[in-house]
Amino acid sequence: LEVQVPEDPVVALVGTDATLCCSFSPEPGFSLAQLNLIWQLTDTKQLVHSFAEGQDQGSAYANRTALFPDLLAQGNASLRLQRVRVADEGSFTCFVSIRDFGSAAVSLQVAAPYSKPSMTLEPNKDLRPGDTVTITCSSYRGYPEAEVFWQDGQGVPLTGNVTTSQMANEQGLFDVHSVLRVVLGANGTYSCLVRNPVLQQDAHGSVTITGQPMTFP
């Protein structure tokens, strides 16, 4: 029995609903009474949702899953996962048996966009050319871990003296703090780019130091 799922991971934003697609080819004369369908976590075989003996056996996964009952008879065994969480990320196996059996695994990739970075400066007053300052770029509640890039006003990457830390909160979302230590010139703009590698989403922050006053666009 051939069971088909998408090759590419399904990408879902935290808090939204995701559909894990799975299909099989019913033989002529197939009835739902014959169908045994199991969705499970691939690694542990933990039951997620099942259908057997013509009946939806329900969700075993925090009551956040559902099948598409009207489509099962046509071979659509897809699973709807509601209110996606970071902890849902991973591989799900769709197992179908009628008289024969087959299975296939689909990957769920969870993502959350990072907030627009906030920029802070230390020290933040009485700055003169030649002073060493610490610029901190902070962006919140993203997933997965971000890539952080710094550059100056001419677009030249700044890679030295950068320290980036990422901490997961209780929901598994990351807060990013990147610190750039730089010696001030006469004036300058310093930009921080926080990139979500899954969403290919960039969040920008910058600070311009012009002597007095400083601006934070």
């Epitope: 029995l1 499970q40 075989k45 039951l47 003996e53 008289r99 024969d100 059996f101």
Partner: antibody
């Protein structure tokens, strides 16, 4: 009438090989998953191996993985179990069986495999 | 792998008795639990599939119940041919499709 007729059992020395056959009739063989189950003397049932209808998916118990090979010839309506590197603990009655999610609804009559020097 | 534990491992009963055998799975298997009777020297025979569905041709004195991890086979009135060994089996998802260790029912 569904029938599964087994053959190929016998006495074999440790390290030897044997091939079991299970000839099916009375149903569309290629539409059904098939399994081998064994029962050591005085012991319980042990699932050994399974194969999908097309033969494209095969599974094995850890105890036989790498030594046994399940296969099928849908043109001959026949299921096979090739057993290599046989050990004394493989001594058992071997059954072929049809089915999966709704259980194994038809079984062969069983064939005895004895591994002894 | 999913383990199945049957209890009791053996029991003695008389014709006409009501007999109950339990099977516990090491993790949730929904209703993918089957019951077999094996008489001495014979192949196993499917009695119950999907926890509670009676296999065609099996007498109605056999019934099954349960879901998740706990399952029960009940024989409402034991007959002479029921003195045999009973096995539970899970067919949850991809193999291995393991069996319980068996329950032998003999004459009291």
């Amino acid at each position: 009438e569904v029938q599964l007729f087994q053959s190929g059992g016998g006495l074999v020395q440790p390290g030897g090989s044997l091939r079991l056959s299970c000839a099916a009739s009375g149903f569309t063989f290629s539409s059904y998953a098939m399994s081998w189950v064994r029962q050591a003397p005085g012991k319980g049932l042990e699932w050994v191996s399974a194969i999908s209808g097309s033969g494209g998916s095969t599974y094995y118990a850890d105890s036989v993985k790498g030594r046994f090979t399940i296969s099928r010839d849908n043109s001959k309506n026949t299921l096979y179990l090739q057993m290599n590197s046989l050990r004394a603990e493989d001594t058992a009655v071997y059954y072929c069986a049809r089915g999966v999610g709704r259980g194994f609804d038809y079984w062969g009559q069983g064939t005895t495999v004895t591994v002894s020097s | 792998d999913i383990q199945l534990t049957q209890s009791p491992s053996s029991l003695s009963a008389s014709v006409g008795d009501r007999v109950t055998i339990t099977c516990r799975a090491s993790q949730s298997i929904s209703i993918y639990l089957n019951w077999y009777r094996q008489q001495p020297g014979k192949a196993p025979k499917l009695l119950i599939y999907a926890a509670s569905s009676l296999q065609s041709g099996v007498p109605s004195r056999f019934s099954g119940s349960g879901s998740g991890t706990d399952f029960t086979l009940t024989i409402s009135s034991l007959q002479p041919e029921d003195f045999a060994t009973y096995f539970c089996q899970q067919t949850y998802s991809t193999p291995p499709w393991t069996f319980g260790q068996g329950t032998k029912v003999d004459i009291k």
